[in-house]
């Protein structure tokens, strides 16, 4: 066992001459997102005061192509690196087409009117003429294609005009827009070279040791990996820490069950029913407050100060109200769950589904008349999945390396 | 469906001042923002300056600032605007114009009133 | 003077194609889509066309528009004697926190 896990220190660490390190630098598994709009079926009867009903379309799957450049090894046992991601369209594994149209609420409209809501009556008054005059409306009929990747909005500019420096966008705005052919920040994790323990955690995150989104220190620490790979010999005492910056936060999974996954060993990880529940719920989430219901994060501090929530597909471990709220929500364990499948000798994933949901709170606001009578609700826009699972040759080689020679070796 | 339904034609001496009225029909009065707009002959329109019925909350152009006044009257469902200190200039016709909800750009008109400022 | 810029008048053969001009600049067209109003002898003013190139309601395929730069247009095509009206730009103009008009262009059918 002490020569096993010699080989296991040897190979898992960041560093050219071991055997992971092409692997963490070019991810050989195939990585899939999935998504999945709600598409609003009544958008009159909603700006009437009438309860939304939605319908799940897709799903709309995505080839994610992921790689590190600008990898700089520092002299304090960590190495920095931009990780790239590009997404293709898989028309065979997708339920629809990228011109397919959704009806969707307007997030610039609605985002906007929220965002508002306090402002002197004077602007809101001006952002009405606006809107009519530039045909902007409560809800919009867009192209998967359009909403995932930007539509030519003259909002854009309109936005940029009345709130300089707050929207990161420039004249297109796509949900999606950001993350293709883009980097996720500068990431400078800890190689193992040195100290085995700290392997693959974050040190910093473009240049911060922690963020400044949120409203308490332990809500803004920078905890965990990057959530590609882990430290290795986990226990099913160990939790998967890991920093999302689409989710501006560190996020902490559980042990849940040990498993095999094409013959490897495996500990499942999942989500705690704390992740997003709020702070009277959960104390230690106070900062990511003000809350709604529970299940729900605000992430209006880091999307440009939209009124946007993450959450659990459909809702999954929220106060029921909010999936009382919409019809045609209906939560389910084994669909909208997520989890991940690592091997616990090396702390590398072998097969996971990352799940999210995005959401829009919209009301009517007095003086934006594009909002008409909105009750106030929390309205799903999409859900998503970030799927991988290792195969082919990586996973003969992963197999042969880290399974059948420890057996050999043991014997 | 909305409908406009404006007052008849007005004439007035430079100095002095003019109401418009302006009833919606069709749906409820307080769902719709009312704008106001200037049409002198021979040109194209202007803006002059809105109000929300829902509060009477109103914002007017630079231009008409000071001599407009904007005005609704929830009981009758109708909305008034008010020119004051006439001029020849202000020889135009009048119309008031709504979105519907949903919609966009001004698709909704009153048929206009023509107001003819002479001494 | 209006702050959209249009030609007094245009004219057409019936079945021929029309186009008008609407210029700006980059605090309005430039920055922002155009609205087209048409308006028929002593009536009011009707939305024809929406956010540069969509008709509003009950417009048919006839009428098309687009936007470069601080200019945009407005097509007919298969002119009809129905057609002979005033055509108006707006959009909206981020210095004047407003929406401007042009002057109109009048459209004769010959």
């Known amino acids: 066992p002490s020569l096993i896990k010699q080989q296991v220190l040897k190979n898992v660490r960041i560093d050219p001459s071991s055997l992971s390190f092409n692997m963490w630098k070019e991810i050989p598994i195939p990585f899939y997102l999935s998504v999945y709009f709600f598409d609003v079926m009544n958008p009159s009867e909603i700006l009437k005061g009438e309860k939304p009903q939605v319908r799940e379309r897709g799903p709309y799957v995505y080839r994610e192509f992921r790689h590190k450049s600008n990898i700089t090894f520092n002299n304090n046992d960590t190495v920095s690196f931009l990780e790239y991601r590009t997404f293709q369209f898989q028309p065979s594994k997708s339920h629809g087409s990228e011109s397919d149209y959704i009806v969707m609420p307007n997030i610039l409209v609605l985002g906007a009117a929220v965002m508002m809501e306090n402002k002197p009556m004077t602007l809101k008054l001006i952002m009405t003429l606006a809107f009519t005059t530039l045909g902007e409306r409560a809800f919009m009929n867009r192209t998967v294609g359009e909403i995932m990747w930007g539509y030519k909005d003259p909002l854009v500019n309109l936005i940029n005009k009345y709130f300089p420096g707050m929207f990161p966008f420039k004249d297109k705005f796509g949900l999606f827009a950001e993350l293709n052919n883009s980097d996720s920040g500068l990431f400078t994790v800890f190689t193992g070279v040195q100290n085995i323990s700290r392997i693959h955690l974050v040190d910093k995150w473009n240049g911060l040791s922690k963020v400044d989104f949120w409203h308490s220190d332990q809500c803004n620490m920078i905890n965990g990996t990057s959530g590609q790979m882990w430290p290795p010999f986990m226990t099913p005492e160990s939790s998967l820490e890991f920093y999302s910056p689409e989710a501006c936060r560190s996020m902490k999974l559980m042990y849940k069950e040990s498993g095999v996954f094409e013959g490897i060993p495996t500990y499942r990880f999942v989500a705690p029913k704390t992740l997003f529940a709020n702070g009277s719920i959960y104390p230690p989430n106070e900062g990511f407050c003000p809350c709604l219901e529970s299940g729900i994060q605000n992430v209006s501090t880091c999307r440009f100060s939209a009124p946007l929530f993450l959450s659990h597909p459909h809702f999954l471990n929220a106060d029921p109200v909010l999936a009382e709220a919409v019809t045609g929500l209906h939560p389910n364990q084994e669909a909208h769950s997520l989890f991940l499948d690592i091997h616990p000798v090396t702390g590398i994933p072998m097969n996971c589904s990352v799940k999210l949901q995005l959401s829009l709170y919209m009301k009517s606001v007095a003086g934006i008349g594009q909002t008409g009578k909105i009750e106030p609700v929390v309205l799903p826009l999409l859900w998503f999945a970030e799927s991988g699972a290792m195969e082919g040759e990586t996973l003969h080689t992963f197999y042969t390396q880290l399974v059948l020679m420890p057996k050999v070796m043991h014997y | 469906e909305v409908q406009l339904v404006q007052s008849g034609a007005e004439v007035r001496k430079p100095g002095t001042a003019v109401k418009i009225s302006c009833k919606v029909a069709g749906d409820t009065f307080t769902d719709y923002f009312i704008y106001w707009l200037q049409q002198a002959p021979g040109k194209g329109p202007e803006w002059m300056g809105l109000i929300d019925p829902k509060d009477a909350q109103t914002i007017y152009a630079e231009k008409f600032q000071g001599r407009v006044a904007i005005t609704a009257d929830t009981s009758t469902d109708t909305a008034y605007m008010e020119l004051s200190s006439l001029k020849s200039e202000d020889t135009a016709v009048y119309y008031c114009?709504?979105?519907?909800?949903?919609?966009?750009?001004?698709?909704?008109w009153g048929q206009g009133t023509l107001v003819t400022v002479s001494s | 003077l209006p702050v959209l810029t249009q030609p007094p008048s245009a004219s057409g053969a019936p079945g021929q194609r029309v186009t008008f001009s609407c210029s700006g600049s980059g605090s309005n067209i430039g920055s922002y889509t155009v609205n087209w109003y048409q308006q028929l002898p002593g009536a009011a003013p009707r939305l024809l066309m929406h956010?540069?190139?969509q008709r509003a309601s009950g417009v048919p395929d006839r009428f098309s528009g687009s936007k470069s730069g601080t200019s945009a247009s407005l097509a007919i095509t298969g002119l009809q004697s129905e057609d002979e009206a005033d055509y108006f730009c707006?959009?909206?103009?981020?210095?004047?926190?407003?929406?401007?008009f042009g002057g109109g262009t009048k459209l004769t059918v010959l």
């Open positions: 114009a709504t979105d519907s909800v949903g919609s966009a750009g001004f698709d909704v």
């Open positions: 956010t540069t190139d």
């Open positions: 707006a959009a909206w103009d981020d210095s004047l926190d407003g929406p401007v």
